[in-house]
C-alpha cells in the first residue's frame, strides 16, 4: 500500500513523498480527493473520513476559504487575510494531522493572476519554513492562469516553479478553461472550444515544466464546470487519454501515462466519468460544492429536528424549566455537519478507489 512507498507515513507529507504518492495512485488507478477546508471543523471532518477509510487525503484552502479561516472580520487588503488564513490553516493541519495516522497533502487551491500577492505571501512562508525545517510549509500550490494566454500562463508558472522546485514542492496548474466560477476566475461565458484543452497545449506545459522538476500536475479542461453551473458543455474525460498519448509520443517515453492530471468541477459527474478520468491519469479530484452542501445537511436536519429545543436557552417540550444547553452547544450541532460532510467524503473515497489504499 501507500505507506510502503512513503518516508513519512502520517501527517503532512512533502517533496519526494508527494511525488511517490501521486505516482503510486496513477499506477494503481485511484485518485485522492482534495477537500476545501475553511475551518478546523471542516478539516477534522475530512481527516476523520480519510482515517476511517484508510486513505490518504488532500486538504486545500482556496483564497476565499483562507480569508475565512483567518476571520471574516479581518480586512483582506493586499491579500492580508488570505495569506494569514492559509498559513494558520497550514500550521493547524500540520499540528493535528499526525493524530489521524494518515498521509496528508497540504495544498492551496486556484490562484488567478489578480490573486498572485496571495501566492507570494504563501511562498514566502514556505521559504521561511524551509530555512528552519528543511521543507516547505505547504506540500503544494495551484496556479490558475487559465484566463491568460497560454504563453503568459506557462511563463508565470515557470517563474514560480523554479522557486518551488528549490524546496521540492509540487505545483498544480490549469490550462484550458473550466466553466463556471471559482475564486477570481469566472468562465461562465467562455467559448465552447476553450472548454476542451488540446493535447498540444498540455504538451507545451510538460515541455516547459518537466526540465525544472517532475513535481507538477495539470488541470486540463474536458468540458468540466465548477460548482453546479448548468452549461451546455458535454463532459469528455476520455479526452485525457489523448493528452497522455500526445505527450508520450512527443517525448518518446515508454511510460504509458507521463502526465499527472487533475479533475476539477466534478459535482454531478457519474462514477463512470470519474473512473474514466482516473484510468487516464487523474490523481487528484477537487471536492468542494458537494462537501459544502453535505456539511449543511447535517446542521439543517439537526436544527429542524430539534427546533423545539433550541428556541430558547431554557424550556422545551419536556418542561418549561428544562435546560437546552446540550442542544445548542456548538460542539453538538456543528458536529452534525462534520458527520454528513464526512459521509460524503467516505463515499467519494470509494468512488475514486482510494479506500484501503494505505
Amino acid at each position: 500500500g501507500v505507506e510502503q512507498i512513503l518516508k513519512r507515513k502520517t501527517g503532512v507529507i512533502v517533496g519526494e513523498d508527494v511525488h511517490n504518492l501521486f505516482t503510486y495512485a496513477k499506477e494503481h488507478k485511484f485518485a485522492i480527493p482534495a477537500i476545501n477546508v475553511t475551518s478546523s471543523s471542516t478539516a477534522v471532518a475530512a481527516l476523520e473520513a480519510a482515517r476511517d477509510s484508510k486513505s490518504p487525503i488532500i486538504l486545500q484552502t482556496s483564497n476565499g476559504g483562507a480569508a475565512y479561516f483567518a476571520g471574516k472580520g479581518i480586512s483582506n487588503e493586499g491579500q492580508n487575510a488570505s495569506i494569514k488564513g492559509a498559513i494558520a490553516a497550514a500550521h493547524y493541519i500540520r499540528s493535528i494531522a499526525p493524530a489521524y495516522g494518515i498521509p496528508v497533502v497540504l495544498h492551496s487551491d486556484h490562484c488567478a493572476k489578480k490573486l498572485l500577492p496571495w501566492f507570494d505571501g504563501m511562498l514566502e512562508a514556505d521559504e521561511a519554513y524551509f530555512k528552519e525545517h528543511g521543507e516547505p510549509l505547504f506540500s503544494s500550490h495551484m496556479l490558475d492562469l487559465s484566463e491568460e494566454t497560454d504563453e503568459e500562463n506557462i511563463s508565470t508558472c515557470v517563474k514560480y516553479f523554479k522557486r518551488m522546485a528549490a524546496m521540492d514542492q509540487w505545483l498544480e496548474m490549469e490550462i484550458g478553461i473550466t466553466g463556471g466560477e471559482e475564486d477570481g476566475v469566472n468562465n461562465e461565458n467562455a467559448d465552447k472550444e476553450d472548454l476542451y484543452t488540446k493535447p498540444e497545449q498540455v504538451y507545451n506545459v510538460y515541455k516547459a515544466l518537466h526540465p525544472i522538476s517532475p513535481n507538477f500536475s495539470i488541470a486540463a479542461a474536458f468540458g468540466n464546470c465548477h460548482g453546479l453551473y448548468a452549461g451546455d458543455i458535454a463532459l469528455r474525460p476520455e479526452i485525457l487519454a489523448e493528452h497522455q498519448k500526445y505527450t508520450r509520443e512527443q517525448v518518446g517515453c515508454k511510460e504509458e501515462k507521463p502526465l499527472f492530471l487533475v479533475f476539477h468541477g466534478g459535482s454531478g459527474s457519474t462514477v463512470q466519468e470519474f473512473h474514466t478520468g482516473i484510468d487516464n491519469g487523474v490523481v487528484k479530484v477537487n471536492l468542494d460544492t458537494d462537501c459544502q452542501y453535505a456539511y449543511l445537511t447535517g446542521i439543517r436536519d439537526y436544527v429542524l429536528n430539534k427546533k423545539d429545543y433550541i428556541m430558547s436557552p431554557v424550556g422545551n417540550p419536556e418542561g418549561p424549566e428544562k435546560p437546552n444547553k446540550k442542544f445548542f452547544d456548538p460542539r453538538v450541532w456543528v458536529r452534525e455537519g462534520e458527520k454528513t460532510m464526512g459521509a460524503k467524503i467516505t463515499k467519494s473515497l470509494e468512488t475514486f478507489r482510494t479506500t484501503n489504499t494505505l
Epitope: D232, I233, A234, R236, E238, I239, A241, E242, K245
Partner: nanobody
Framework: QVQLVESGGGVVQPGESLKLSCAAS????????MGWFRQAPGKEREFVAR????????FYADSVKGRFTISRDNAKNTVYLQMNSLKPEDTAVYYC????????????WGQGTQVTVSS
C-alpha cells in the same frame, strides 16, 4: 459539418454479433469525437459509446460495457461498433454522431440503421 451514413444493421439472434459502420465525409472527421447512440421503439435516444479523435480514449454506457467495442479508422473516415453477445433489449435504431470540439456536444447525426435481436 460532417455527413454521416450508417450501415451494417440487420436481424440477429440473441448471443450473436454484428458490426456497424459509419462512413463520414467532411474534413473535420479526424479531429472529431465520434459516438454511437440508439433509440428503441417508444423510448428516448440513448448514448451507447464514443471515441476520441485518435482512438486513444473511449467511453461506454454501462449497459453495453464489455459487450460492445467502438473503434475508428481515420484513413477510411469510418467509425465502427462491434456488438457481441447481443440481447433482445439491444433492439433499436443505431445512430452515428460527430462532435467537433467547437460544438460542446454532438452536432452532426446520421440517419440510423436498424438492429433487431430476436429469437
Amino acid at each position: 459539418q460532417v455527413q454521416l451514413v450508417e450501415s451494417g444493421g440487420g436481424v440477429v439472434q440473441p448471443g450473436e454479433s454484428l458490426k456497424l459502420s459509419c462512413a463520414a465525409s467532411g474534413r473535420t472527421f479526424s479531429s472529431a469525437i465520434m459516438g454511437w447512440f440508439r433509440q428503441a421503439p417508444g423510448k428516448e435516444r440513448e448514448f451507447v459509446a464514443r471515441i476520441t479523435w485518435s482512438g486513444a480514449g473511449v467511453f461506454y454506457a454501462d449497459s453495453v460495457k464489455g459487450r460492445f467495442t467502438i473503434s475508428r479508422d481515420n484513413a477510411k473516415n469510418t467509425v465502427y461498433l462491434q456488438m457481441n453477445s447481443l440481447k433482445p433489449e439491444d433492439t433499436a435504431v443505431y445512430y452515428c454522431a460527430a462532435q467537433a470540439l467547437s460544438q460542446g456536444d454532438f452536432g452532426s447525426w446520421g440517419q440510423g440503421t436498424q438492429v433487431t435481436v430476436s429469437s
